[in-house]
Amino acid sequence: IVNGSDCQKDAQPWQGALLLGPNKLYCGAVLISPQWLLTAAHCRKPVFRIRLGHHSMSPVYESGQQMFQGIKSIPHPGYSHPGHSNDLMLIKMNRKIRDSHSVKPVEIACDCATEGTRCMVSGWGTTSSSHNNFPKVLQCLNITVLSEERCKNSYPGQIDKTMFCAGDEEGRDSCQGDSGGPVVCNGKLQGLVSWGDFPCAQRNRPGVYTNLCEFVKWIKDTMNSN
């Protein structure tokens, strides 16, 4: 997150981190039920660990943290390169969470976000637009949902109904490492960090997010059948 601020501890209890090896954070994720996470399909890896209830970027133990393994990764069947439509993936964890003030699921929005809606994006991604400077703690940023027209004008031929744009204030954006993390509007999960331009946080190059209102049925059906 570029030019965000430290999240309040436990203010994003649905925020998850996907880790490679001992502690290499490579994507964000969102807790949507006691045993299921959502992340971006482009975050798929064969082996990873899941960390919930953690505020710091570092591996130092925190009392609210809970660690899990992913036992099933189910990317949306429509995700493909190079268009990046349908950029979402369900992850089933090896056990259910212990519900606490640090770890709680978030409800997915059934209605699509409208232009001007204020939302919160969060993550441990890089805080510099073109270099890997990672934050000490989880970062939060208020962003505004942009019109479909403005979104398509920013990225001609690259936007479809499975995406929405938000942000667009120069110097503020999600960035590398935030992928798969939550965009929460009015207390409900509206999107996932999907993609954007490089360097991050450029004028007229807003962040592009997976439009989760289009996938409520697929998410419910997939969880029920697995």
């Epitope: 971006a40 190079p82 268009g83 490089f198």
Partner: antibody, heavy 127, light 108 residues
Framework: QLQLQESGPGLVKPSETLSLTCTVS??????????WVWIRQPPGKGLEWIGS???????YYNPSLKSRVTISVDTSKNQFSLKLSSVTAADTAVYYC???????????????????WGQGTTVTVSS | DIQMTQSPSSLSASVGDRVTITCRAS??????LNWYQQKPGKAPKLLIY???SLQSGVPSRFSGSGSGTDFTLTISSLQPEDFATYYC??????????FGGGTKVEIK
Amino acid sequence: QLQLQESGPGLVKPSETLSLTCTVSGGSISSDDYYWVWIRQPPGKGLEWIGSIDYFASTYYNPSLKSRVTISVDTSKNQFSLKLSSVTAADTAVYYCARGRPLGYGARHDYYGMDVWGQGTTVTVSS
Amino acid sequence: DIQMTQSPSSLSASVGDRVTITCRASQSISSYLNWYQQKPGKAPKLLIYSASSLQSGVPSRFSGSGSGTDFTLTISSLQPEDFATYYCQQSPYFPPLTFGGGTKVEIK
């Protein structure tokens, strides 16, 4: 300002291994989220991608050369290297190292363009 | 492999002319296309990335457009220093990264 410099022998015998090194100055090879790329250009011809290595030290090779190519990185020396085995006259070319700059973040991160290049080094394969 | 076809392979133009070079991909590459300029004996130089974004320091007379399979590089008013060979390049998630065959812009 980032600069790249290729080094290695200008003449290699057929069936031997071509070894080149690219030294990165003006920036760290490990601190930035970039790809490090080898490209070659046979005399009077177009550009051919050989392979790339990323910040995870994952390697990506041109399938037409994959069985003969190794790319590695040495962060302590701020260098990355190319080895091409069993060379023939068809491997005679100018070899360039370059930095691959991602075209975006997230789902767009694995797509890149080469924004900084070395000046190139000529390698001739001949006995 | 995705094939990149550039046309024309060469062209003659005068200073001040508007020059257009096209690049066609054998399948959709979204906006993942870059353009380079190469002068004799020199390394290529990135001009345009992501089909239409101008690389820092490149004159505004260069512009790029297109998405999917068809792309265009335009030089709005050719300058003496623009006589060179131009290459398009697609950057795939799956290798190989491939270049077009090049377009040589010569003085008429």
